[in-house]
Amino acid sequence: DAEFRHDSGYEVHHQKLVFFAEDVGSNKGAIIGLMVGGVV
């Protein structure tokens, strides 16, 4: 689980570059405690 964090808000995780907060609008429950399927 290599993880390198950058000031840009991006990180290398499992050899891929992802913006950590990018999926908060997804239907996966990325926001802690937000009921998925509610008004987003």
Partner: antibody, heavy 112, light 111 residues
Framework: QVQLVQSGAEVKEPGASVKVSCKGS????????VHWLRQLPEKGLEWIGR????????IYTPKFQDKATLTVDTSTDTAYMELSSLRSEDTAVYYC?????WGQGTLVTVSS | DIVMTQSPLSNPVTPGEPASISCRSS???????????LYWYLQKPGQSPQLLIY???HLASGVPDRFSSSGSGTDFTLKISRVEAEDVGVYYC????????FGQGTKVEIK
């Protein structure tokens, strides 16, 4: 009633490991990310990491990278967090969260 | 790490009166996509925390509209228009621009 039910309180000696479970009741835990947080005594919240039950992919806060291991058993709708090499500083209440549901918390006490 | 700093740490309030809590982040939480990755949680006595506000100003489901949140990229305020007895507990701000970090908490209690 839809809820997340965590395993009971644990007392462990320094250096030991502990595995905390989080079972969905009336809730498919394999559908959404499962987050784990901890709350030190009389302190604030710390995010440990999260797991995507669909593919097992995990993301950890760096300080927990070598401390916590997150897994999910989709056949039983149960998420697990294993903590290794326990120290007294790991004494805390540990919470699992999925969608809008929080577990009740599990107190892990590390003491010799 | 992005550090979240709250003030005050303790806030005695009077029922029916307004109250506010401040939170400052060590880095702007406003992303170029226009979203601000700031959250507010409440932990009532003896309970697990609950989400109040997400992405700075969106009210979570079931949260009374007496709660509101505003701010810039680094300075944020949670406001309660009229405090009720059930609002007591510890309020945490949090960010997830880079992983998740939480403020140290503000304890709200009735005077």
């Amino acid at each position: 009633q839809v809820q997340l039910v965590q395993s009971g309180a644990e007392v462990k000696e320094p250096g030991a490991s502990v595995k905390v479970s989080c079972k969905g009741s009336g809730f498919n835990i394999h559908t959404y990310y499962v987050h784990w947080l901890r709350q030190l005594p009389e302190k604030g919240l710390e995010w440990i990491g999260r797991i995507d039950p669909e593919n097992g992919e995990t993301i950890y806060t760096p300080k927990f990278q070598d401390k916590a291991t997150l897994t999910v058993d989709t056949s039983t709708d149960t998420a697990y967090m294993e903590l290794s090499s326990l120290r007294s500083e790991d004494t805390a209440v540990y919470y699992c969260v999925s969608s809008g549901y929080w577990g009740q918390g599990t107190l892990v006490t590390v003491s010799s | 790490d992005i550090v979240m700093t709250q003030s005050p740490l303790s806030n005695p309030v009077t029922p029916g009166e307004p109250a506010s809590i401040s939170c400052r982040s060590s880095k702007s939480l406003l992303h170029r996509n226009g979203k601000t990755y700031l959250y507010w949680y409440l932990q009532k006595p003896g309970q697990s925390p609950q989400l109040l506000i997400y992405q700075m100003d969106h009210l979570a489901s079931g949260v009374p509209d007496r709660f509101s949140s505003s701010g810039s990229g680094t300075d944020f305020t949670l406001k309660i228009s009229r405090v009720e007895a059930e609002d007591v507990g510890v309020y945490y701000c949090a960010q997830n621009l880079e992983l998740w970090t939480f403020g140290q908490g503000t304890k709200v209690e009735i005077k």
